[in-house]
Amino acid sequence: DTYKSEIAHRFKDLGEQYFKGLVLIAFSQHLQQCPYEEHVKLVREVTEFAKTCVADESAENCDKSIHTLFGDKLCAIPSLREHYGDLADCCEKEEPERNECFLQHKNDNPDIPKLKPDPVALCADFQEDEQKFWGKYLYEIARRHPYFYAPELLYYAIIYKDVFSECCQAADKAACLLPKIEHLREKVLTSAAKQRLKCASIQKFGERAFKAWSLARLSQRFPKADFTEISKIVTDLAKVHKECCHGDLLECADDRADLAKYICENQDTISTKLKECCDKPLLEKSHCIAEAKRDELPADLNPLEHDFVEDKEVCKNYKEAKHVFLGTFLYEYSRRHPDYSVSLLLRIAKIYEATLEDCCAKEDPPACYATVFDKFQPLVDEPKNLIKQNCELFEKLGEYGFQNALIVRYTKKVPQVSTPTLVEVARKLGLVGSRCCKRPEEERLSCAEDYLSLVLNRLCVLHEKTPVSEKVTKCCTESLVNRRPCFSALTPDETYKPKEFVEGTFTFHADLCTLPEDEKQIKKQTALVELLKHKPHATEEQLRTVLGNFAAFVQKCCAAPDHEACFAVEGPKFVIEIRGILA
């Protein structure tokens, strides 16, 4: 459909509340350092303008694209260069280059302090102005996660508001709020990581990579739907994510709503698990569909070999319609293997494709590809064995100890990577233990590998901004589906020149005593990385001794009457001790 005014069309489709929310998210994801009030002003102006276009689509500037309108708004900010430096250079470009330029300036690791929930203050804000409270939440999440899936953020904002509606009435606000906020925070962080991977796959590996990922995922989730149905949903979903990743948030949210509507209208041919979802209001409905439980497998599935090995037309199908044929293979394989990770399914499809590419050029293709399914077993065994070993290590060491083992492992593999990044990534990798190791056997593989893909994508995104390791660049860019095996296969870097010992790195202060447990751990793990960068060949025994001594040193000083004085005296002794242990 063509509309005289795109902004009027989106305003009418989405309604004022969602329109304002999405515009706020869009501005917050681009201008991540601007105060909330500045964004509110921009949103108000854009909304007023949209309303004039709804009243008269022929009004001045209403025919302009949303990119043009948003870009003009950003570029009109007087302090743009002062606060954002070379982002202001984008304003010298014309659309669509200007929008591309804005996208390139999104910062995945903005210097914004961590949000610390204060139940009393938050409840006061909530009761004073619910609308502002909702907007502030969108702003705070969007500026910290510039690729967050905008329509899904609107959903989380509703859940956030509901938590406060309930808990601010409670006698003990903190007891009600804090666990709920923490639970929501984990969900939001996972959602941010999932979307970041989707955007990375589209932007770095192309739309086809994203479609293959979605095809495998949806085939696992909706095994009763046939290939044609899944293909249609994949195509529409790719459009939605391309738009959101490209900053076209209004179009993205609108198209996502259309897709949810289509899925619900056709749920009989898609999945038996969508009934509850489809009775919900729009944002909950879309979220529910995205999180839907896996449907049961149809009972009458034929062995895959019939169509992909025994059928005499395999090479004809492959040669004449490569993408469709390989798509059908991925669909059929995925729906039969809900227990496999998406990355593993895509690796299997790659092997199948490579085998046909080779065999179909030979004299006797059927004889050549007859054993293709046997080639898949090593691909399945590799992650299964790895998960088994790591889960055993997790059971033995516990979460903190397992994280430390990963810190050692990854610092030795890629010591050039910055210390904060190594700590963040290794800590997240370590969470795979509590997330997946307790799961039933048939869920472990997909849980672990799909989660690791999210964490390694975070490493790749951070590393791309300031590349320091050829190994990391290689693993991140060569193949999306082989990232995890690539990182797993890295060995300690023997070419690394150890860092000089800097005493300041091991200087601690009284604030350590009052830090929450997780922040205390981060301090210790930061020291561990620095230690390894100084002594890459330190033995496990030496490291264990240093960590034990460190814990004792901190405990001693935090029990002393004057924390700071203790750290001043004991700190230098501790440094000498470290050097002695590692000598």
Partner: nanobody, 126 residues
Framework: EVQLLESGGGLVQPGGSLRLSCAAS????????VAWFRQAPGKEREFVAG????????YYADSVKGRFTISRDNSKNTLYLQMNSLRPEDTAVYYC???????????????????WGQGTLVTVSS
């Protein structure tokens, strides 16, 4: 889910031609891999020709290559089999079969097709 109804069979002399039709309902024929099979008295059902769903790739049994042509008209949701240079050994009941959601895979294995028409008899005799 898919209903198929064949027509166009009959008696024809050797060397003659016939055009079989298969009307589908309940599903768009262009989304479905469809095929013609035949069964002569006292023999097993055998694959004759097939066409992919969504992608017009055609498949033929060696015995009919160059004589038979499979096609479909998406607007009419109908599958056709144009049979030329007919021989007595082509005498059989011809069945239309469908595999929904299988765009390309037009297997020659009858068991893999969940939907079948009731068949139309073709007799080639002088």
């Amino acid at each position: 889910e898919v209903q198929l109804l064949e027509s166009g069979g009959g008696l024809v002399q050797p060397g003659g031609s016939l055009r079989l039709s298969c009307a589908a309902s309940g599903r768009y024929i262009d989304e479905t891999a469809v095929a013609w099979f035949r069964q002569a008295p006292g023999k097993e059902r055998e694959f004759v020709a097939g066409i992919g769903g969504g992608v017009d790739i055609t498949y033929y049994a060696d015995s009919v290559k160059g004589r038979f042509t499979i096609s479909r008209d998406n607007s009419k949701n109908t599958l056709y089999l144009q049979m030329n240079s007919l021989r007595p050994e082509d005498t059989a009941v011809y069945y239309c079969a469908a595999r929904p959601g299988k765009p390309l895979i037009t297997s020659k294995v009858a068991d893999l097709y969940p939907y079948w028409g009731q068949g139309t008899l073709v007799t080639v005799s002088s």
